[in-house]
């Protein structure tokens, strides 16, 4: 099941997949100039069975201004709904991708890809949080969110990250604690 | 079901002290912020600040610094507003609610009333 | 500290009739903006977040719009059950702060 809507965006963070569920989809985008190739497929797709996962599909971008008879291909607005853009970006922690079965890792690059990438997530998408540069978490809860079916509709849960200013102070029970931890998931949160 | 359940209505006289508490259920407590409205009489909502039941890292609205204290209990799943010496001013209807960015779960609020 | 201010203070329209209630903010607050309902007697109720995005299970007469300093909530069809007062609330920079409140009647 697709998420209807994209991750919820917070103040001064940005967020980042350290692996993707099978069923993920990643749109086919090309950099300015380029387009897919004719008969190009319009998304990759994580796929795979009980022992691997893997995408299947091939994104393949040409120039714009190769001699092509066939129109530019791009997806109708059913097929690519908007969704959040995320810049291609290291991890943010150190989550081996690896060794989540059911997922697939960050797709390599391909030649001529857009800058930003498009993905479609699926119910049980985990996605980490990350303050930008300038700014430090309040506190070293969790700083995920999680696409959830609740009443049978898709809902990402609330981020518990909050990405303060370096001049705003706030209280700490002891030293300051550092960012981000996984230990705690803000997902077992009862649905009716 | 998420639900926030907060302690009963208050009479206090001003310079005495009190502590209001609110229970949450139905999620993970330690992993949501919980913050504090104060609705005075007849007025409008002011946010008072939130409180990581997790680990109890506090921030405080400007306008409430050192007028009351945070805390939570995940043990109980409980989070509390406390003052130290009451004034009339502090008479209003109180609620907690889950954050920490919009406010999603609210309790039914606490009524304090401080009168001579 | 943001300044949220919200107009009209009061708003009488008929049932059925089309609502709109504005929030500014004293500066850009990235859509950040969540509207909130209270009841008479009641808690206030998340209607919307994120400028737009709509709660579980609010009616989806109500919609939201807008972007940087300016957002509008909007009753497509006002209800006798939508009487209450409306509150914005921006969550961009701490501390988060709350329009002072519409007042919605019938007329």
């Known amino acids: 099941e697709l998420c209807d809507d994209d991750p919820p965006e917070i103040p001064h963070a940005t967020f980042k997949a350290m692996a993707y569920k099978e069923g993920t989809m990643l749109n086919c985008e090309c950099k300015r100039g380029f387009r897919r190739i004719k008969s190009g497929s319009l998304y990759m797709l994580c796929t795979g069975n009980s022992s691997h996962s893997s995408w299947d599909n091939q994104c393949q971008c040409t120039s714009s201004a190769t001699r092509n008879t066939t129109k530019q291909v791009t997806p109708q607005p059913e097929e690519q709904k908007e969704r959040k853009t995320t810049e291609m970006q290291s991890p943010m922690q150190p989550v081996d991708q690896a060794s989540l079965p059911g997922h697939c890792r960050e797709p390599p690059p391909w030649e001529n890809e857009a800058t930003e990438r498009i993905y479609h997530f699926v119910v049980g998408q985990m996605v980490y949080y990350q303050c930008v540069q300038g700014y430090r978490a309040l506190h070293r809860g969790p700083a995920e969110s999680v696409c959830k079916m609740t009443h049978g509709k898709t809902r990402w849960t609330q981020p518990q990250l909050i990405c303060t200013g370096e001049m705003e102070t706030s209280q700490f029970p002891g030293e300051e604690k550092p960012q981000a931890s996984p230990e705690g998931r803000p997902e077992s949160e009862t649905s009716c | 079901e998420v639900q926030l359940v907060q302690s009963g209505a208050e009479v206090k006289k001003p310079g005495e002290s009190l502590k209001i508490s609110c229970k949450g259920s139905?999620?993970?407590?330690?992993?949501?912020?919980i913050g504090w409205v104060r609705q005075m009489p007849g007025k409008g909502l002011e946010w008072m600040g939130i409180?990581?039941?997790?680990?109890?890292?506090?921030k405080y609205s400007p306008s409430f610094q050192g007028q009351v204290t945070f805390s939570a209990d995940k043990s109980t799943s409980t989070a509390y507003l406390q003052w130290s010496s009451l004034q009339a001013s502090d008479t209003a209807m109180y609620y907690c609610?889950?954050?920490?960015?919009?406010?999603?779960?609210w309790g039914q609020g606490t009524l304090v009333t401080v009168s001579s | 500290d943001i300044q949220m201010t919200q107009s009209p203070s009061t708003l009488s329209a008929s049932v059925g009739d089309r609502v709109t209630i504005t929030c500014r903010a004293s500066?850009?607050?990235?859509?950040?903006l969540a509207w909130y309902q209270q009841k008479p007697g009641k808690a206030p109720k998340l209607l919307i977040y994120?400028?737009?995005s709509l709660e579980s299970g609010v009616p989806s007469r109500f919609s939201g719009s807008g972007s940087g300093t300016d957002f509008t909530l909007t009753i497509s069809s006002l209800q006798a059950e939508d009487v209450a007062v409306y509150y914005c609330?921006?969550?961009?920079?701490?501390?988060?702060?709350f329009g002072q409140g519409t007042k919605v009647e019938i007329k």
């Open positions: 609610v889950r954050g920490p960015y919009y406010l999603d779960y």
């Open positions: 139905g999620y993970s407590f330690s992993n949501y912020w």
């Open positions: 409180i990581s039941p997790g680990d109890s890292t506090t």
């Open positions: 500066q850009s607050v990235s859509g950040y």
């Open positions: 994120k400028t737009s």
């Open positions: 609330q921006q969550y961009y920079s701490t501390p988060w702060t």
